[in-house]
């Protein structure tokens, strides 16, 4: 007996071939011997089965001796043994219809769990193997669980259902609601304008919610809310903003914040949260601000950085076109009685310059 696997809601074509390539009498019946469709003269006739409004045949192939039965909008209960009667012979085809659906909404927050449930006909014992867009393989039986969704799980999941050495493939689109980056750091010289951007890793037709940026300045003992905002159909409106600093926010996505001036007292780290309408939980993105200041006071040339820096970062003071350099893995470096000329303060990571500030030392007479 031939086995054919089908997908719930899909279409299947069951084939039946006569030995002679010509138009002849044929009938398709179910296991209860109820006629589904057949030929009468040159016309397709339908029987009293519950499939009749969803069953059809490729009439154009009848004169080739091919008498297919097409079943549209498959249901799990269409799983049955179908019998094609042609030229005094019977061909049996066992149809097994499976459905694979996500238990919840397919738009899930990062860290939430995804459960896929397999609907299958009674008596079947299928196995399921799913592959995430990032190449992660998960196996299961009637249910498949992904406990903690990650950003890279967004996209089309391909799930293969196997039964009797046959397979059928399902594609399920999963959208992981998250920011494109978990964390970002902005490096600025004192006095420069600071731009913070929070691009989303997904697109939704309607995007509504509310958000807030909490800031923990390095010099402050506690964090404070810098700005709160609403998001309505991808339009951003500010609800409340602190007086110091006076942040500005873009009206369109991606979420965009501007700090007029980078000052040492603002250096630190922030956490932007976004709560989406009809979703439990919040999206998070961490943002860091590192501020550099180079100053000359009497005989002392100093370069300092404030904000969250890694211990492996190097801070250097270097005289342009000269070999004179002082470097430290610290947040401040200085040179006593510096030579006259243009000095560069550099914050670097393994040779890659993250931030630089120039200061001119004039000769003292």
């Amino acid at each position: 007996k031939k086995v054919v696997l089908g997908k719930k809601g899909d279409t299947v074509e069951l084939t039946c071939n006569a030995s002679q390539k010509k138009n002849t009498q044929f009938h398709w019946k179910n296991s209860n011997q109820i006629k589904i469709l057949g030929i009468q003269g040159l016309f397709l006739t339908k029987g009293p089965s519950k499939l009749s409004d969803r069953a059809d045949s490729r009439k154009s192939l009848w004169d080739q001796g091919c008498f297919s039965m097409i079943i549209k909008n498959l249901k799990i209960e269409d799983s049955d043994t179908y019998i094609c009667e042609v030229e005094n012979k019977k061909e049996e085809v066992e149809l097994l219809v499976f459905g694979l659906t996500a238990n919840s909404d397919t738009h899930l927050l990062e860290g939430q769990s995804l459960t896929l449930t397999l609907e299958s006909p009674p008596g079947s014992s299928p196995s399921v193997k799913c592959r995430s867009p990032g190449g992660k393989n998960i196996q299961g039986g009637r249910t498949i669980s992904v406990p903690q969704l990650e950003r890279q799980d967004s996209g089309t999941w391909t799930c293969t259902v196997s039964q009797d050495q046959k397979t059928v493939e399902f594609k399920i689109d999963i959208v992981v609601l998250a920011f494109q980056k978990a964390s970002s750091t902005v490096y600025k010289k004192e006095g420069e304008q600071v731009e913070f951007s929070f691009p989303l890793a997904f697109t939704l037709e309607k995007l509504t919610g509310s958000g807030e940026l909490w800031w923990q300045a390095e010099r402050a003992s506690s964090s404070k809310s810098w700005i709160t905002f609403d998001l309505k159909n991808k339009e951003v409106s500010v609800k409340r903003v602190t007086q110091d600093p006076k942040l500005q926010m873009g009206k369109k996505l991606p979420l965009h914040l501007t700090l007029p001036q980078a000052l040492p007292q603002y250096a630190g780290s922030g956490n932007l949260t976004l709560a989406l309408e009809a979703k439990t939980g919040k999206l998070h993105q961490e943002v860091n601000l590192v501020v550099m200041r180079a100053t000359q006071f009497q005989e002392n040339l100093t370069c300092e950085v404030w904000g969250p820096t890694s211990p492996k970062l190097t801070l250097s003071l270097k005289l342009e076109n000269k070999g004179a350099t002082v470097s430290k893995q610290a947040k401040a470096v200085w040179v006593l009685n510096p030579e006259a000329g243009m000095w560069q303060c550099l914050l670097s990571d393994s040779g890659q310059v993250l931030l630089e500030s120039n200061i001119k030392v004039v000769p003292t007479w």
Partner: antibody, heavy 121, light 108 residues
Framework: QVQLQESGPGLVKPSQTLSLTCTVS??????????WSWIRQHPGKGLEWIGY???????YYNPSLKSRLTISVNTSKNQFSLKLSSLTAADTAVYYC?????????????WGQGTMVTVSS | EIVLTQSPGTLSLSPGERATLSCRAS???????LAWYQQKPGQAPRLLIY???SRATGIPDRFSGSGSGTDFTLTISRLEPEDFAVYYC?????????FGPGTKVDIK
């Protein structure tokens, strides 16, 4: 989404054999109950169905072209091909590849953009 | 083979008007074995209707199909500027699959 792209020579000499290939992108040629067709359109005229190959590899040809026609599939390259022999000027046409699926069987829901074939010495 | 005849050969109408295109088969193609296509110059045909009256994916509801047996109709309720094209009917009730000669809908 699924796209079809025809390729082959634009000019063929009479009595020679025409070879055209249709490359399917966006889906596997063997993934569904699809039938893959060749259809042609003579300059300024209507459409003529040439034949098709099914998901199972069965071929069905227009009787008027059957003796000169071969349609085959290469699943590893996601392509299907047409070979039409003993060409005459009457075979000059735009050749399209197309797909039908069982939910709208024998009606062609996706077409290639077509390739013009001229039979001339 | 089943021969399809389309009428009229050319239909001259203005945008906003109703267009009624006819397709007649030389013998019955069954109740639903007929499709309609639209073709614009230099482009491949586009499936509009299959199964005599089912709209293909993405086709606006101003296009509708009706008929069975040997007589079928494509109706465009209100012509839009982009609807001016050639329309073909195709039968799949019998092998070989055949197309009609087409009806050209042009701007009056």
């Amino acid at each position: 989404q699924v796209q079809l792209q025809e390729s082959g020579p634009g000019l063929v000499k009479p009595s020679q054999t025409l070879s055209l290939t249709c490359t399917v992108s966006g889906d596997s040629i063997s993934s569904g109950y699809y039938y893959w067709s060749w259809i042609r359109q003579h300059p300024g005229k209507g459409l003529e169905w040439i034949g098709y190959i099914s998901y199972s590899g069965s071929t069905y040809y227009n009787p008027s072209l059957k003796s000169r026609l071969t349609i085959s599939v290469n699943t590893s390259k996601n392509q299907f091909s047409l070979k039409l022999s003993s060409l005459t000027a009457a075979d000059t046409a735009v050749y399209y590849c197309a797909r039908d699926r069982p939910s709208n069987f024998d009606a062609f829901d996706i077409w290639g953009q077509g390739t013009m074939v001229t039979v001339s010495s | 083979e089943i021969v399809l005849t389309q009428s009229p050969g050319t239909l001259s109408l203005s945008p906003g008007e109703r267009a009624t295109l006819s397709c007649r088969a030389s013998q019955s193609v069954g109740s639903t074995y007929l499709a309609w296509y639209q073709q614009k110059p230099g482009q491949a045909p586009r499936l509009l209707i299959y199964g005599a009256f089912s709209r293909a994916t993405g086709i606006p509801d101003r296009f509708s199909g009706s008929g069975s047996g040997t007589d079928f109709t494509l109706t465009i309720s209100r012509l839009e500027p982009e609807d001016f094209a050639v329309y073909y009917c195709q039968q799949y009730g019998s092998s070989p699959l055949t197309f009609g000669p087409g009806t050209k809908v042009d701007i009056k």
